[in-house]
């Protein structure tokens, strides 16, 4: 267990031309707040998962009113750190999203209004217990400067916060099999604390709070012997009463979702669907009203003027969840039209279009034959988002603008000589061959391999190919 800490140093216009207009004005004073979302791993997959490592919302910053005519300065920031507690091991590699939100304090009907000013994202490697890491990220014309670190909560130590330390029981040495806890040499590594009730004989753990079973034992606490007989249950062959094989504990066992949240298993762990008024990885954050800005990703908050009344987030297309915190699996919607290939890069959606289609979502059919002229008597043939010209004899190229060299492909066989002709090509055949392309040998007795030669044509005469 531990805490990820984020310190925002500044948010203001980035270097270079095109400084952004101040987000606040005398008519519309405003204040900033920040949201951080953490996800484990560096994979593309992780980039669009929910904030599985946790999320945090900062306090509101001081109210700011733009001075008329002045360029947007660095804007006043909220006090303090953003802290994202993590219960399990620190993954070492993680993805982050930091959103800068503006709360407008003008005379809005129905309370203040929120809008997303900037969103930055990145993927980083970070060992727990290390020093503060500094970062600068740009979003459009804005620049965000910040530092972050991950630190373990005692008694956990180590780069992943998985080793546990306890003060030494004896001044000279640690217990059998336990090493000193560098850099805290006055402490000793403590044995892992497994899930409460985990069988000491048949269970073990590699992570705190875990209970893994030795062969032959099963159940959430490894107290059920595995039977060789087969039996069926909704989750496979399992039954605690008959001693059949039961799967290890599922991530939703014991429902980790607080406050009436419902748990659903995901390939990596679990996801809580929270009732209104609660959010967070385990629905542990409560007492939220619209004044807290609970709707993420541009969601519109309705109702909930006081802590006892619920709010509703109306999510923009592409987002879902009670707080609009979950992005729709965008590629599952098959957004790339006309057979395009979808790539969800996390920060953006990309479509790789089939030939003949273009646009961000392959929505632009490159119009086949519309407005497309084939020169020199060619005709346009449509097909699958592409067009081609079927050219008249003697012409070639994409638009039939090139004069074709009919002899370029060496069409005359057996050493025949090719001559370009206004209506095509002519082959002058070598002795012993005949045919339009000199493809037929003349038999030694003078008879050709053809059933009959065209009248008036001697073997060896030039043949015109029409």
């Amino acid at each position: 267990a531990g805490v990820f800490e984020l310190q925002i140093h500044s948010f203001g216009p980035g270097p270079g031309p095109g400084a952004p207009r101040s987000p606040c004005s005398a008519r519309l004073p405003c204040r900033l707040f920040f949201r951080v979302c953490l996800k484990p791993g560096l994979s593309e997959e992780a980039a669009e998962s929910p904030c599985a490592l946790g999320a945090a919302l900062s306090a509101r910053g001081p109210v700011y009113t733009e001075q008329p005519g002045a360029p947007a300065p660095d804007l006043p920031l909220p006090d303090g750190l953003l802290q994202v507690p993590f219960r399990d091991a620190w993954p070492g590699t993680f993805s982050f999203i930091i959103e800068t939100w503006r709360e407008e304090l003008g005379d809005q009907i129905g309370g203040p209004a929120w809008s997303l000013l900037a969103r930055v994202a990145g993927r980083r490697r970070l060992a727990a217990g290390g020093p503060w890491a500094r970062d600068i990220q740009r979003a459009g014309a804005w620049e965000l400067r910040f530092s972050y670190r991950a630190r373990c909560e005692p008694p956990a130590v180590g780069t992943a916060c998985t080793r546990l330390c306890r003060p030494r029981s004896a001044p000279s040495r640690c217990g059998p099999g336990l090493r000193p806890c560098a850099p805290l040499e006055d402490e000793c590594e403590a044995p892992l604390v497994c899930r409460a009730g985990c069988s000491p004989e048949h269970g073990f753990c590699e992570q705190p709070g875990e209970c893994r079973c030795l062969e032959g034992w099963t159940g959430p606490l490894c107290t059920v012997p595995v039977s060789t007989s087969s039996c069926l249950s909704p989750r496979g062959p399992s039954s605690a009463t008959t001693g059949c094989l039961v799967p290890g504990p599922g991530p939703c066992d014991g429902n980790p979702c607080a406050n009436g949240g419902s748990c659903s298993e995901t390939p990596r762990s679990f996801e809580c669907t929270c009732p209104r008024g609660f959010y967070g990885l385990r629905c542990e954050v409560s007492g939220v009203t619209c004044a807290d800005g609970p709707c993420f990703n541009g969601g519109l908050c309705v109702g909930g003027a006081d802590p006892d009344s619920a709010y509703i987030c109306h999510c923009p297309p592409g987002f879902q969840g009670s707080n609009c915190e979950k992005r729709v699996d965008r590629c599952s919607l098959q957004p790339c039209r006309n057979g395009g290939l979808c790539l969800d890069l996390g920060h953006a959606l990309r479509c790789r279009c089939r030939a003949g289609f273009a646009g961000p979502r392959c929505e632009h059919d490159l119009d086949d034959c519309a407005g497309r002229a084939c020169a020199n008597g060619g005709t346009c043939v449509e097909g699958g988002g592409a067009h081609r010209c079927s050219c008249a004899l003697g012409f070639g190229g994409r638009d039939c603008r090139e004069r074709a060299d009919p002899c370029a492909a060496r069409p005359c066989a057996h050493g025949g000589r090719c001559y370009a002709h206004f209506s095509g090509l002519v082959c002058a055949c070598a002795p012993g061959y005949m045919g339009a392309r000199c493809e037929f040998p003349v038999h030694p007795d003078g008879a050709s391999a053809l059933p009959a030669a065209p009248p008036g044509l001697r073997p060896g005469d030039p043949q015109r190919y029409l």
């Epitope: 809008s115 919607l333 646009g359 979502r361 929505e363």
Partner: antibody, heavy 121, light 107 residues
Framework: EVQLVESGGGLVQPGGSLRLSCAAS????????IHWVRQAPGKGLEWVAY????????YYADTVKGRFTISRDNAKNSLYLQMNSLRAEDTAVYYC??????????????WGQGTTVTVSS | DIQMTQSPSSLSASVGDRVTITCRAS??????LNWYQQKPGKAPKLLIY???RLHSGVPSRFSGSGSGTDFTLTISSLQPEDFATYYC?????????FGGGTKVEIK
Amino acid sequence: EVQLVESGGGLVQPGGSLRLSCAASGFTFSDYGIHWVRQAPGKGLEWVAYISSGGYTIYYADTVKGRFTISRDNAKNSLYLQMNSLRAEDTAVYYCARGDYDDIFYTMDYWGQGTTVTVSS
Amino acid sequence: DIQMTQSPSSLSASVGDRVTITCRASRDITKFLNWYQQKPGKAPKLLIYYTSRLHSGVPSRFSGSGSGTDFTLTISSLQPEDFATYYCQQGNTLPWTFGGGTKVEIK
């Protein structure tokens, strides 16, 4: 609250020009593509033009291609439609409408109240 | 261009009636079909996107279905505020095209 407010409509002679504006508020303008859609008197809706969030992708209906130009100024939260060589058949109420967040659906999820363009001699 | 054909062009119904409007595309548009409602003198409003997804704030009596070329908008129990003109729009291939509209009038 998402708001789009069109302006710049009016009466113009055939062959003349007009510039429509659309002022946006209540959302992060630079995150969304915007459409212009028009409606001739007593008729249905006709899509006119589209510009993506960053202004890199621009599309026009064939009926206006070469005569109309769509543009945007994200710093001013504003969208524009420059209309040249106007014809009688361009007479309509012109609406600006916000596209969806990722251009996944090509919806028009919020609309302005419209501005009327009349082309007549 | 993809032609969108709506039927009927108008219909009369009473409050509480179940109303169905159909929209046919001239070629496959998968599920990229959106429905809008427009009242006289007002701007259109998005009701349903991606064939069946309700836009925020739209009552659940509105529903959509279909795929490919044939789509349906259903109002399960018509309310007084539902008397309006409804348009379908395809978002699959440029240019974006609308159906001709279906006017729902009071019987």
